[in-house]
Structures are given as C-alpha cells and as structure tokens.
C-alpha cells in the first residue's frame, strides 16, 4: 500500500504530515518544482496550530508557502479552498504592490519575519517548505 508509519529522512513529522525545510533560497516556481519532485507540495497552512509549527521551524526568515494568485484568485497548491480556509496576512496585505520596479505585481505568498503572510514578487529567492501527508508518502523514505 501507500501508507507509511513515519516521515522520510530529513523530514519532520507533525500532525500526520511531513515537513521539509530548505536551507537556501529559490524563486517560488523553482521551490514548487522541488517539492513536486519530492512527491510533495509547498506547505499549505490550514490552522493556527500548523502556522505556529511552521513558524517555529523557519524562524524570522522570508519563506515561500503553497499559496499564489498567478492566475487570478488566490489558490492553495493542493486545492484547499482559500476563501473558507485559514489566513494570516499582515495588515493591509495582500496588496499586489507594483512599486517594486521589477515588473508586474505580487502573486506569491510567503511567511515574513514575524510569521504573518505577505504577497511578493514570485522571482525572489526565498527559502521554502515542502509538505506531504503521511498516508500519501511511499513505503520507502526518499533521499534528497
């Protein structure tokens, strides 16, 4: 079967999910690719409890999550409903700011230094977090 009892090597288990925390930075799309090649996805935050867990592990560092509005409305990468789901934006965010001078607005969400969320230019090389559910992980632990 596809169920497993524990998380892969280098991943952290929490509430039936496995989390992997990067040590370097990538653009949002590249981070998304990385997680997919781990048969995982960029982290999807569904509760205050999960928010606190991720925040504790990443510290005060800008870090991508699996939330974007590159095609219009805000969407979680795993299909979790954005409108009815947990949110933790900074005040007055998201603002799709165009004043950065990099072209376009801000279409990708990240954890800021205080853990609250901000939308930013997707090309910025931020750290990232991958997540996979325990019952979706394979029998063998993937080695990075």
């Amino acid at each position: 079967g596809s169920e497993r009892a524990c998380c892969p090597v280098n991943w952290v288990e929490h509430e039936r999910s496995c989390y992997w925390f990067s040590r370097s930075g990538k653009a949002w799309a590249d981070a998304d690719n990385y997680c997919r090649l781990e048969d995982a996805h960029l982290v999807v935050v569904t509760s205050w409890e999960e928010q606190k867990f991720v925040q504790h592990h990443i510290g005060p560092v800008n870090t991508w999550m699996g939330l974007h509005d590159q095609n219009g409305p805000w969407k979680w990468v795993d299909g979790t409903d954005y409108e009815t789901g947990f949110k933790n934006w900074r005040p007055e965010q998201p603002d799709d700011w165009y004043g950065h001078g990099l072209g376009g607005g801000e279409d990708c969400a990240h954890f800021t230094d205080d853990g609250r969320w901000n939308d930013d230019v997707c090309q910025r090389p931020y750290r990232w977090v991958c997540e996979t559910e325990l019952d979706k992980a394979s029998q063998e632990p993937p080695l990075l």
């Epitope: 048969d39 993937p142 080695l143």
Partner: antibody, heavy 121, light 107 residues
Framework: QVQLVESGGGVVQPGRSLRLSCAAS????????MHWVRQTPGKGLEWVAI????????YYADSVKGRFTISRDNSKNTLYLQMNSLRAEDTAVYYC??????????????WGQGTTVTVSS | DIQMTQSPSSRSASVGDRVTITCQAS??????LNWCQQKPGKALKLLIY???TLETGVPSRFSGSGSGTDFTFTISSVQPEDIATYYC?????????FGQGTRLEIK
C-alpha cells in the same frame, strides 16, 4: 554494490521510436529520484529528464519535451526513457543517473555506463 | 537556463603538479555544484558534491570550493590515474546544466 545498467540503444531512422531501460541494483530504487542525461561530442553533457521517487512528477529538457517520456517501475527496479519522433540531433550516448543526497538540490551521485543511440537514415 | 562556463578546456600537467579548474555559473546557484570525472569508456564518477564535500571513497587530493557563482576544483598532487575529463554540474534548478569539460593530460 550500487549499479545502473542501461540497455535498448541502437540505430534507428528519423521519426521512429526507441525505448531505453536502466536496471538498478545494490540500493533501494524506490527511495531515489532518477535522471536521464545524454552526451554528444559536439554538445557535451545534456540533461534530459528527471522523475520523482514514486514516479508521479517529471520534468524534461525543452529539447525533448513532448517527444520523450521518463517513467519507472519500482517493482522491477527499472527506469525507462521512451523516445518518439527521433531526430538526428538525438544521436548520443544516454546515461541514467541516480539523484544524490544533496540537501535541496537535484545532483547525480551514481551513473551508468551508457547506451548509444544513433538516429540515421 | 543557468549557463556553466568551465576553464580551461584542457590542461597538461606533470605527476605531482597542483591543478586547478574553475567553473562560473551565470546566476547564483548557492552551493549546488558537483564535480565529476569521466575516464574513456567508463561511467562518470562523482568526486565532489555541494561544491566542497568529498564523496565517500574519493582520495583527499581532490577538493572543491566556492559558492554563489564562482567555483574551483583542485587536484593537489596529480597522479597518473587522474587522466580524465572533469565536469562541473549545477543542480540548483532544472534544467540541470554542465560545464564543457576539462581534459587533463599527463606530460
């Protein structure tokens, strides 16, 4: 010991198809992502494709996208590369390689000996 | 795509010489760089990963350094068995890309 052995190469006409295989042994195949890489005297080493350890996710070089398909059968410890609509420029030695243990990267740590594909009319 | 510029393309050295090869990435790749060795008719062999970590079983005369865009590979004392072509490879992002190779010959 850890070993990767490619097979399936040969001479094929332009527009035809070929399937390469890579038999893995000496490690838990289902725990590793895998790559195909090719080498030509003119262009050197060129990455072709990568597949995740379960096989759900795949990425390709632009030069082969839509023509080549990477797949794997973890029950047989085998990696495949289905090559369709072959062109003269696909002529190369094809290597399979294991995705290594770098934290956050995609590097290769073990390579096969390679199998030669020649596309010629 | 990230371009990898490797130099020199060939190098002739005497046994015992110190040999240095450089590799430059067209954009920041952190430390996501391998150095591989290819001998004629043999499989490629990983020597250095993460820019500076020696692969298990590889002799300590091989070393690597660098981060970001500029990287160096060194053989501190060349041995006859080191005759080969050496490649750098970035694996920060797909598509993975390689340097053009450096062919090492012994005088």
């Amino acid at each position: 010991q850890v070993q990767l052995v490619e097979s399936g190469g040969g001479v094929v006409q332009p527009g035809r198809s070929l399937r390469l295989s890579c038999a893995a042994s000496g490690f838990t195949f289902s725990s590793y992502g895998m790559h195909w890489v090719r080498q030509t005297p003119g262009k050197g080493l060129e990455w072709v494709a990568i597949i995740s350890y379960v096989g759900k996710n795949k990425y390709y070089a632009d030069s082969v996208k839509g023509r080549f398909t990477i797949s794997r059968d973890n029950s047989k410890n085998t990696l495949y590369l289905q090559m369709n609509s072959l062109r003269a420029e696909d002529t190369a030695v094809y290597y399979c390689a294991r995705r290594g243990n770098s934290y956050g990267g995609y590097g290769m740590d073990v390579w096969g000996q390679g199998t030669t594909v020649t596309v010629s009319s | 795509d990230i371009q990898m510029t490797q130099s020199p393309s060939s190098r002739s050295a005497s046994v015992g010489d110190r040999v240095t090869i450089t590799c430059q990435a067209s954009q920041d790749i952190s430390n996501y760089l391998n150095w591989c060795q290819q001998k004629p008719g043999k499989a490629l062999k990983l020597l250095i990963y993460d820019a500076s970590t020696l692969e298990t079983g590889v002799p300590s005369r091989f070393s690597g350094s660098g981060s970001g865009t500029d990287f160096t590979f060194t053989i501190s004392s060349v041995q006859p068995e080191d005759i080969a072509t050496y490649y750098c490879q970035q694996y920060d992002n797909v598509p993975i890309t390689f340097g053009q190779g450096t062919r090492l010959e012994i005088k």
